[in-house]
Amino acid sequence: RTRSGSQLDGGLVLFSHRGTLDGGFRFRLSDGEHTSPGHFFRVTAQKQVLLSLKGSQTLTVCPGSVQPLSSQTLRASSSAGTDPQLLLYRVVRGPQLGRLFHAQQDSTGEALVNFTQAEVYAGNILYEHEMPPEPFWEAHDTLELQLSSPPARDVAATLAVAVSFEAACPQRPSHLWKNKGLWVPEGQRARITVAALDASNLLASVPSPQRSEHDVLFQVTQFPSRGQLLVSEEPLHAGQPHFLQSQLAAGQLVYAHGGGGTQQDGFHFRAHLQGPAGASVAGPQTSEAFAITVRDVNERPPQPQASVPLRLTRGSRAPISRAQLSVVDPDSAPGEIEYEVQRAPHNGFLSLVGGGLGPVTRFTQADVDSGRLAFVANGSSVAGIFQLSMSDGASPPLPMSLAVDILPSAIEVQLRAPLEVPQALGRSSLSQQQLRVVSDREEPEAAYRLIQGPQYGHLLVGGRPTSAFSQFQIDQGEVVFAFTNSSSSHDHFRVLALARGVNASAVVNVTVRALLHVWAGGPWPQGATLRLDPTVLDAGELANRTDSVPRFRLLEGPRHGRVVRVPRARTEPGGSQLVEQFTQQDLEDGRLGLEVGRPEGRAPGPAGDSLTLELWAQGVPPAVASLDFATEPYNAARPYSVALLSVPEAARTEAGKPESSTPTGEPGPMASSPEPAVAKGGFLSFLEANMFS
């Protein structure tokens, strides 16, 4: 069957796999006049890798809480048994009711864009629900994800998130929108309002048009022991133990303390949704307790003192002292001042000496004063804040915060690449490729100090020499290395990096990138001498930029062969001279040759070789460049991409035969790189360039 080049380049010729994984097809090429011998196009088929998603793909979250994604929720696998690190999820559409973030990264940062299955297994991918202003009973969120692991085809996944007050939540013991308890002065009355007790989230389970005729019925199952509940001034008692959410909302529920002490009080209740006129509806219900704290009317509330942030290194433990948490309260003992953790950061937890290994959520000032309270930095090295509430048991709780700054245990200066300075410019900006500090995360606030300066140049910021600079200045491209001495092709300097109290040193290497166009083309024939000219090495642009004639010095190579100066004409006396130095002018004059040798001690065949050159020009630093080339046994039928000044001896003896194309000792025609009429890079051009022989 015949296929044309245009069909190939138009993508109209398809290969359909069937049978074994290794195989291919034979073909010949013809331009209508000439036909090439047979070729074989090898095709290797890969087994198709399939990705699959298991797990419920549903996550139940307690309102206002953080819940890790787990393997029960999201579990990807591949038919090739791919490492979970290589199973990548991309967040196509993030959550609407909260956010997704990584436990080991700053929880205040940007939304998570991608994560791996391994991170899911580790429990590091967290969904945080953000409480809306309006009450709700159940809310639904979705995350649209795309699972990918090349070469497998991507798989779309939807993770459904159910945020429900129905769920049993250790972080939130109440199923109601609010159940905060009440503070009442001894012997006095206080209104219980929806700021303290609010079941409007139960009502939210009813569609809004019908909501006005529904209500929540509270039945008191255990009455206060030190006071009385009243609804619209009517006392509640065992015979009349009910009140409604609507009465609460109207401010009709009151607790009256009976006096005689400041012991705790409270009541237990059941609450359920009821329909119009109390009819039954299939709505939510809950049984809970409402706490009432009676305080001494003469008491002065505690005064929180200014707090110093706690600083400690990642992976360590540090005691919390009065510098972090203290109050002034003349009429309370330290043991009576209680702290409760309302919200904890993700960078560690509080623990009590002798209180078990796990985190504590309640402690006293006495625990702080005695040094029993400590912070364990088991998370990432980020700053975090504990939101606490503090109370002396007699005054309403006061909000307090404790800032914890986790310092990295060690930092590393990452040097991804040496600094390359363009030869004609003599200067270049540093970037994250040269200097970047990481601990367990990136350190964008890092600062650098020069502890050993460069020998042949300066570091500049804003055009002025500097010995100190920041990561921010690097990222903005403001830190520049400039050569001041044009005698070396490389330099180096040493910096000390400082990030959040930890330092590390590193050496930045500087190299000059030669302004030289190098083109070796296809393989060069062993045993031949080819012309070195601007089609192979060209420093013409450097010549223009420096208004000088660039000079080349041969530093190394070739391993098999040598660079020679060739006579201008046959009449010129002497053979080829070995060259160690030459100029751009020599190249342009065509006076240089490269004798391509044969590798000794091995069978004839393809080989590789190179030249290492130092390029000099006026007023710019020198640069080292290399010319890498491939060699092969001479093939008279092959159109080489460079001019051949001579061909191997063996080929010359064949000169009388019709196939010989290069007269002895004469420069061969300069063969250009084959460029067929079809678009470059097409399949046909690949075949033409590589398969005619």
Epitope: E234, S246, R270, H272, Q274, P276, A277, A279
Partner: antibody
Framework: QVQLVQSGAEVKRPGASMKVSCKAS????????IHWVRQAPGQGLEWMGW????????NYAQKFQGRVTMTRDTSTSTVYMELSSLRSEDTAVYYC??????????WGQGTLVTVSS | DIVMTQSPDSLTVSLGERATINCKSS????????????LAWYQQKPGQPPKLLIY???TRESGVPDRFSGSGSGTDFTLTIDSLQPEDSATYYC?????????FGQGTRLEIK
């Protein structure tokens, strides 16, 4: 002391309308639904409907739909029940009842309405 | 509508004995969400309005003597009056307060001998 005091007995001709009142006292009027229940002589109890004194919303039994209207006057804490197109079988004692949830904890003394030609 | 059926229509029980009245609903009046049975019992004496005895099938109203008790769930309920007193002579009604229209049983007349 919760009290529901109803208007006095009435005699009506068939086809006429009647309007019975129920005045509440001793509690917050707008907090509790008022229901109307009737009892024909020697018969059982029959629920007619409810009114929410707070919103004025009503719900009537299908049997009385189109004939009954319940209204309230929050300034006097009074609820009214009007029944039109009276027939002899509407002869009954009409009770108003205050509901706590949906059971009837307090009842008015009843109003006898006789429909006779 | 939920139909309430009481049995017996009438009964006569000796003073000091126990009386049992049954009530059956045509469909369940149990709310599975809050586990409440929406059923009440009333007592009515001639010339008087009814008086609430029991709600939620088994909760006694304030001031009701503890000789009165309610039991049952779903569709079958019972009012039990222990050690009958002369003043217990009356007509007893069950009522479902599960859904509107709220409906009553036809009544059970209790006489004391």
């Amino acid at each position: 002391q919760v009290q529901l005091v109803q208007s006095g007995a009435e005699v009506k001709r068939p086809g006429a309308s009647m309007k019975v009142s129920c005045k509440a006292s001793g509690y917050t009027f707008t907090n509790y639904y008022i229901h109307w229940v009737r009892q024909a002589p020697g018969q059982g109890l029959e629920w007619m409907g409810w009114i929410n004194p707070n919103s004025g919303a009503t719900n009537y039994a299908q049997k009385f739909q189109g004939r009954v209207t319940m209204t309230r006057d929050t300034s006097t804490s009074t609820v009214y029940m009007e029944l039109s197109s009276l027939r002899s079988e509407d002869t009954a004692v009409y009770y108003c009842a205050k509901s706590w949830v949906s059971w009837f904890a307090s009842w008015g003394q009843g109003t006898l309405v006789t429909v006779s030609s | 509508d939920i139909v309430m059926t009481q049995s017996p229509d009438s009964l006569t029980v000796s003073l000091g004995e126990r009386a049992t009245i049954n009530c059956k609903s045509s469909q369940s009046v149990l709310n599975s969400k809050n586990n409440r049975n929406y059923l009440a019992w009333y007592q009515q004496k001639p010339g008087q309005p009814p008086k609430l005895l029991i709600y939620w099938a088994s909760t006694r109203e304030s001031g009701v003597p503890d000789r009165f008790s309610g039991s049952g769930s779903g569709t079958d309920f019972t009012l039990t009056i222990d050690s009958l007193q002369p003043e217990d002579s009356a007509t007893y009604y069950c009522q479902q307060h599960y859904s509107t229209p709220f409906t009553f049983g036809q009544g059970t007349r209790l006489e004391i001998k």
